[in-house]
Every structure is written in C-alpha cells, then in structure tokens.
C-alpha cells in the first residue's frame, strides 16, 4: 500500500489556510474536485466541491471554504478562512473520476489550529479580513448534502454563511456510482 504523507500547517484562530493541490494531469482539468476531512479510521467526508464540470478560475464558496480550480496550472486552490480550533484535523483534495474511485492528490494536509493571541483580530498578514470580497454569486453548496434513492427536502444551513443548494444537485440518479467514498488501505 502507498505510504500516505502529510504536510503540517500550524495556524492561529482567525487565520486562513491556503493550500494548492497540484493535479498536473491535463485530463483532470474539468473533472469535479472536492475537499474532504478524514475522520478517525480513514473515513473521508466531503465538505465542499467544485462544479461539475469544474470551471476554470471560478471561485466556489461553501461556508468558510473557498475552492478555485486553475486548469492552466493544474492546481486546485483551497482556502479555509477564519479558522477555528475545531477545524483542526486531517484533510485531502480528491478528483472525482467516475466510475473509478476518486483520485487523491498528495499530500494530505494536517491542520492544527490554536487559540490566537489577544491582539487585534486580523492584525497580521495571514488574517482573513479581505476574503469575503469574493462576489456572493460564487456562494454555492455544490456537493449534494445527502445522496439517497429517496427524495429529500433541502434547506440552506442556518449559519452566517449563506449556502444554498441548487435544485439540480438534489435528486441525482445513480449518484452513489458517481461519488463513491475513497478508500485508502
């Protein structure tokens, strides 16, 4: 089995995680990509997705997560803004490539968020003061919240982030074959 490597990021609350997942392969340029958290026991959970097909340089914001796919450079830029201690964990970028398993982009990201100092919020260069200048039209929940053979009533999350779910993403057919969870042994 492939040894999975991790890149560690240690940041303070309120700062922004800014990572670039390099996929280099031209054939994956328009493939849908996702940002996942890995729960204990190798149980990835998708937190945010690009559109399907993925649009070039088009920022997609899902809560505090912003994804931008740069086809020309073969990289997915992931930002998690206004970091909270609870965001600490293991993350990864994946490319959906149905009907095969998603392709994982190395390295995994080990995020450690610690309490910040009591100084002025946003006083350092890594702060997140300007992140929300991204046009609000990019704010979408593009991953289905819930995939099941049954119809599900959707509602946006009750939080400060305005996340809506396009109707086209709710009732997908054969969706389990499209977005199977990745497996790492």
């Amino acid at each position: 089995a492939t040894k999975l490597t991790e890149e560690k990021y240690e940041l303070k609350e309120g700062q922004t995680l800014d990572v670039k997942c390099d996929y280099t392969l031209e054939k994956f340029a328009s493939s849908q990509k996702a940002w996942q958290i890995i729960r204990d026991g190798e149980m990835p959970k998708t937190l945010a997705c690009t559109e399907r097909p993925s649009k070039n340089s088009h920022p997609v914001q899902v809560g505090r997560i912003i994804l931008e796919d740069y086809h020309d450079h073969g990289l997915l830029r992931v930002r998690m803004v206004n970091l909270q201690v609870e965001d600490s964990g293991l993350y990864q970028c994946v490319i959906y490539q149905p009907p095969k398993e998603p392709h994982m982009l190395f390295d995994r990201i080990r995020l450690v968020v610690t309490k910040g100092f009591s100084g002025t919020p946003g006083s350092n260069e890594n702060s997140t003061q300007n992140v929300y200048k991204i046009p609000p039209t990019t704010t979408k929940a593009l991953c289905p919240l819930y995939t099941s053979p049954r119809t599900v009533t959707q509602a946006p999350p009750k939080s400060t982030a305005d996340v809506s779910t396009p109707d086209s993403e709710i009732n997908l057919t054969n969706v389990t074959d499209i977005i199977r969870v990745p497996v790492f042994n």
């Epitope: 729960r39 204990d40 026991g41 190798e42 149980m43 959970k45 998708t46 937190l47 945010a48 899902v62 809560g63 505090r64 997560i65 998690m80 909270q84 609870e86 965001d87 398993e101 929940a141 991953c143 289905p144 919240l145 819930y146 995939t147 099941s148 053979p149 509602a155 999350p157 009750k158 939080s159 400060t160 982030a161 996340v163 969706v175 389990t176 074959d177 977005i179 199977r180 969870v181 497996v183 790492f184 042994n185």
Partner: antibody
C-alpha cells in the same frame, strides 16, 4: 428499496462472544459507511463504531476498543459486528445503520435490531 | 468526546398543540462548510430509530412539515408545530461533527 436486515436474537453467557450480521440491499454497498449503535433495555442510544465497507477500515468508540471487531463481506453486501468478553451490561439491542454519503453524516437507514442477552 | 444534553426528559403533550425539545452540545457542531452536524431521530415504541432532521434543519424524506429543526453552534431545537398521536416516542439528537458520534439522552413525548 434500501434495506438493512439483521441476524436473529442471541443469548450468550458472560465471557463469550457474539457476532451480529447486517445484510444490505437496494443500494451500492461499498458507497456508504456503516455504523453500529446499541441500546440497553430502557436506555438511550450508544454509538459503537463505523466501518468503511469499501476498504474495510474501522473506527471504534473508546469504550469498546479491544472488544469489538467490525468486518464486511462485499460479495454478500454484509457487515458484521463481533463483541467479545461479554458481560451482563452488554445486554442490548444492536442496530446497524447506514451513513448517508457526501456532505451530510446522518444515519438514514437502520436495521431492525438484534437483541443480545448476556446471562449466566 | 462531544457531550449532548437534551431537555426535557419527558414531554406530555396535547394533540394539536406545539412541542419543543432542546439539545445542547459541549462543542460547536458548525463545520467549516457552514453546516451544523446535528441530527434528530425519533424512536417509536418497539421500532428502530428513524431520521427526522439532518444537518440541523433539513427534513429527511417523508418527514411531515410539522417537524422543524433550528439552531447553530451548540444550541439546537426540534419543534413540532401540531403534535399528532403518531408522534409519540423518544426523540434523540445526535452529533455527527466528529467521531465518536454521540447521542443526547432522549426526550420521551407522550400524549397527556
């Protein structure tokens, strides 16, 4: 339709082991995680652990670490939960439950439950 | 582990009247993607639990619109706008923010 069918009731002696099965149908078995939750008589729900049917990886609640083993057989779309060194406090109904895929992490389909009685 | 605290323990209700159950978590259940990883389940007498509300406020398939979920962070509420006889049972909240998943102690809803 989506269904989880569990094995029948078991009566075990203290110190023994029990293996409960949960057969899935109506969906792609390897695409959804499976959880095990138990409920002692008259008590609430208690999460035991989770298995990824695709790769077989597992995560167990600390309380059951070392005593519980979750496995799967993809050829029969069945997951198993084995609990060893049984004691009277393990008398409970054991449920398997499917976790929805993608963003949500809810348990949308549950088995009918398997009653395990531990008594000398 | 995240501790889930539910109240009240028991809730006698009159059919047609509203009902409300509270659930509090020891840590925030709001994930970075803007969703609260809090579910509500109903266990009717002699049955397996069934999903009512997921991600804090989304009704699951086939769940009547008299059920609604609200709240964010650490405080959540399940409301039944008009209780019906078939709503009796034990209601549980569950956090799915991190493993181990944990349940509240349950609220028993019974008809007065």
């Amino acid at each position: 339709q989506v269904q989880l069918v569990q094995s029948g009731a078991e009566v075990k002696k203290p110190g023994a082991s029990v293996k409960v099965s949960c057969k899935a149908s109506g969906y792609t078995f390897t695409s959804y995680y499976m959880h095990w939750v138990r409920q002692a008589p008259g008590q609430g729900l208690e999460w035991m652990g989770i298995i990824n049917p695709s790769g077989g990886s597992t995560s167990y609640a600390q309380k059951f670490q070392g005593r519980v083993t979750m496995t799967r057989d993809t050829s029969t779309s069945t997951v198993y939960m084995e609990l060893s060194s049984l004691r009277s406090e393990d008398t409970a109904v054991y449920y398997c439950a499917r976790e929805v895929s993608m963003t949500a992490a809810s348990l949308d389909v549950w088995g009918q439950g398997t009653m395990v009685t531990v008594s000398s | 582990d995240i501790v889930m605290t539910q109240s009240p323990l028991s809730l006698p209700v009159t059919p047609g009247e509203p009902a409300s159950i509270s659930c509090r978590s020891s840590q925030s259940l709001l994930h970075s993607n803007g969703y609260n990883y809090l579910d509500w389940y109903l266990q009717k007498p002699g049955q397996s639990p069934q999903l009512l509300i997921y991600l804090g406020s989304n009704r699951a398939s086939g769940v009547p619109d008299r059920f609604s979920g609200s709240g964010s962070g650490t405080d959540f509420t399940l409301k039944i706008s008009r209780v019906e006889a078939e709503d009796v049972g034990v209601y549980y909240c569950m956090q799915a923010r991190q493993t181990p998943f944990t349940f509240g102690g349950g609220t028993k809803v019974e008809i007065k």
